[in-house]
Amino acid sequence: GSMAHSDGIFKKEQAMCLEKIQRANELMGFNDSSPGCPGMWDNITCWKPAHVGEMVLVSCPELFRIFNPDQDMGVVSRNCTEDGWSEPFPHYFDACGFDEYESET
């Protein structure tokens, strides 16, 4: 079913994200003690590492296109602050119609 299909997509996206973060950390010279916000997979989408004061924008994940193929994709942002990543704005549920990955149960 579509959820089984989406399960595979999410696992693939997560693996790709972790690779992207590793590459970005190397390019930006980020390590665990660096100021700023580490890259992260938030169980929905991938956030690249960012410097304090930077706003990062991402599109709603490709999975949303499976459920809504004809729609423009929403955009979600997070700010990198001295305290770390801000909450996403808008929240995924409002921007994308979906706020967490559901596995088949």
Epitope: D72, D94, D99, E102, S103
Partner: antibody, heavy 123, light 107 residues
Framework: QVQLQQSGPGLVKPSQTLSLTCAIS??????????WNWIRQSPSRGLEWLGR?????????HYAVSVKSRITINPDTSKSQFSLQLNSVTPEDTAVYYC?????????????WGQGTLVTVSS | DIQMTQSPSSLSASVGDRITITCRAS??????LNWYQQKPGKAPKLLIY???MLQSGIPSRFSGSGSGTDFTLTINSLQPEDFATYFC?????????FGPGTKVDIK
């Protein structure tokens, strides 16, 4: 055809609990594409979204900050209905209360509404 | 909370007129905006979602446009059943907030 039928008392005393129910026909409260919302309308505050419940493998709620400490929205899957409880009411909570179904297509919108229930808070 | 304002607050028009109602958001809301029509004693009725998408069953004389902070609802060739109050609503951020309404009455 989706229909929402509201029920509950029209008069509530200050400090008591306002309780309303919204019965769903033509859809299910467990529909994974829908959300189930409560909105109220008064001359002083206009239309005010209060919150919603929805099912995505588990039940979730979102509430407006203005009522968050006093509100509960509960689904009842056995009767395919959902309810609103608003505690510690004051005369400012006097309003017409509506239930509505939320659907997603590029954004969330309210496409089917209940008939509305005028609730007066007065002793 | 995102504040929604509408103008005018009321307008008088005749059958056959073309009217435009404006809605402004206090911050950028992309196209996460809906329009509703309400008649006295009735619940609001969805007309337009996502700024410009016509809800199923709504006549094509209704149209929506805009993005960012400024939006418009246009009714071409106003019909007798269109005399009502119209509300915009942002759907980008909870709590979803509504405009104060624009009442359209008969001139």
């Amino acid at each position: 055809q989706v229909q929402l039928q509201q029920s509950g008392p029209g008069l509530v005393k200050p400090s008591q609990t306002l309780s309303l129910t919204c019965a769903i026909s033509g859809d299910s409260v467990s529909n994974k594409q829908a959300t189930w919302n409560w909105i109220r309308q008064s001359p002083s505050r206009g239309l005010e979204w209060l919150g919603r419940t929805y099912y995505r493998g588990k039940w979730k709620n979102h509430y407006a900050v203005s009522v968050k400490s006093r509100i509960t929205i509960n689904p009842d899957t056995s009767k395919s209905q959902f309810s609103l409880q608003l505690n510690s009411v004051t005369p400012e909570d006097t309003a017409v209360y509506y239930c509505a179904r939320g659907m997603w297509n590029q954004n969330w919108f309210l496409d089917h509404w209940g008939q509305g229930t005028l609730v007066t808070v007065s002793s | 909370d995102i504040q929604m304002t509408q103008s005018p607050s009321s307008l008088s028009a005749s059958v056959g007129d073309r009217i435009t109602i404006t809605c402004r958001a206090s911050q950028y809301i992309v196209r996460y905006l809906n329009w509703y029509q309400q008649k006295p004693g009735k619940a609001p009725k969805l007309l337009i979602y996502a700024a410009n998408m016509l809800q199923s069953g709504i006549p094509s004389r209704f149209s929506g446009s805009g993005s960012g902070t400024d939006f418009t609802l246009t009714i071409n060739s106003l019909q007798p059943e269109d005399f009502a109050t119209y509300f915009c609503q942002q759907a980008i951020n909870q709590p979803y907030t509504f405009g104060p309404g624009t009442k359209v009455d008969i001139k």
